[in-house]
């Protein structure tokens, strides 16, 4: 025998109390497929979440986070603050890159400068706490005749511009 | 209480900004939406602002309305008007969380004729 | 698109009879529709929501049904007062922040 509530589509449920009829999901619940006996709270967006898409019969609400925030992990289950960039989010608080790290982002953490001699370049541009080194073309390229790139004088402290 | 305001006679693509003031609750906290409905005609759904501050339109008036809001008023801004726009526009807040129109206005009339 | 077909257009019955109104779904919405009754010259009037749920203020002789594409509005023990014109509303999200809240196109009830 086929099971009656199998004819119960997303958005109700079996019920049980009325002879296994599909009876709509109540507000804030929801059946994302169909046969269900019971119907799912929905998810509320509240404090620094903020409702990106509002809960319906059929599936979840969707949150995010409010501006100064960002999500983590899946379905935005956390909101984790933000830094400027050239910063990065710590115990205390959201902390400049340390010299010689950078983060072009407002999450995450900073990263060290790519180091240029490893693939054998030159740096181009210095890096800054928000941005990465450019690196230039390898040493030998700029023998005489090859380029009129000239390779910047080397700063006192690379990687930070002067105040 | 929720009223709308800004409806009136209007020249073929003229742009046109409606605006609904509310009262007795804080518009941050709920779906907005404005329908609107052309004389002895049925009712258009046009769009929504939600709690979270996003905005949804139905596929005819994406592009050519703009729903926005402050804390005491939501905006409906309309461009390239036609006669076909000619309707009361009608603004609600959501009921329960959801962006079904359940509190409504009284409406205003805009009409679009040269 | 969610195309709504409400059925009947019109619909004639004395006091106290039942009234039964329609509305098909073009697809599957699950059961987030709504009915609003409208008299002329007013708003809309919200009844129910959710397919089932009375909302606030609305007697209990209105009672939706329904769910995925077949949809019932039946208005029990009519009253003069019930002389409107009734819609049925979807509540259906598409791609790229488009919606497909579409309303069917109405229902009159009048009196014999």
């Known amino acids: 025998l086929q099971d009656p509530c199998s004819n119960c589509p997303a958005g109700t449920f079996c019920d049980n109390n009325r002879n296994q009829i599909c009876s709509p999901c109540p507000p804030n619940s929801f059946s994302s497929a169909g046969g269900q006996r019971t119907c799912d709270i929905c998810r509320q967006c509240k404090g620094v979440f903020r409702t990106r898409k509002e809960c319906s019969s059929t599936s979840n609400a969707e949150c995010d986070c409010t501006p100064g925030f960002h999500c983590l992990g899946a379905g935005c289950s956390m909101c984790e603050q933000d830094c400027k960039q050239g910063q990065e989010l710590t115990k205390k608080g959201c902390k400049d890159c340390c010299f010689g790290t950078f983060n072009d982002q407002k999450r995450g953490i900073c990263r060290p400068w790519t180091n240029c001699s490893l693939d054998g370049k030159s740096v181009l541009v210095n890096g800054t706490k928000e941005r990465d080194v450019v690196c230039g073309p390898s040493p030998a390229d700029l023998s005489p005749g090859a380029s009129s790139v000239t390779p910047p004088a080397p700063a006192r402290e690379p990687g930070h511009s002067p105040q | 209480s929720v009223e709308e305001s800004g409806g009136r006679l209007v020249t073929p693509g003229t742009p046109l900004t409606l605006t609904c003031t509310v009262s007795g609750f804080t518009i941050s906290s709920h779906h907005m939406i404005w329908v609107r409905q052309a004389p002895g005609e049925g009712l258009q759904y046009i769009g929504f602002i939600n709690d979270g501050d996003y905005t949804y339109y139905t596929n005819w008036a994406k592009g050519r309305f703009t729903i926005s809001r402050t804390s005491t008023t939501v905006d409906l801004k309309m461009t390239s008007l036609t006669a076909a726009d000619t309707a009361t526009y009608f603004c609600?807040?959501?009921?329960?969380?959801?962006?079904?129109?359940?509190?409504w206005g009284p409406g205003t009339l805009v009409t679009v004729s040269s | 698109d969610v195309v709504m077909t409400q059925t009947p257009a019109s619909v004639s019955e004395p006091v106290r009879a039942t009234v039964t109104i329609k509305c098909q779904a073009s697809q599957s919405i699950g059961a987030d529709l709504a009915w609003y009754q409208q008299k002329p010259g007013q708003p809309p009037k919200l009844l129910i929501y959710?397919?089932?749920t009375l909302a606030s203020g609305v007697p209990s002789r209105f009672s939706g049904s329904g769910s995925g594409t077949e949809f019932t509005l039946t208005i029990s023990d009519l009253e003069c007062a019930d002389a409107a014109t009734y819609y049925c509303q979807c509540i259906y999200y598409g791609t790229d922040d488009v919606i497909y809240h579409t309303f069917g196109g109405g229902t009159e009830v009048v009196f014999k």
């Open positions: 959710r397919a089932s």
């Open positions: 609600a807040r959501g009921v329960d969380g959801t962006s079904y129109p359940g509190l």
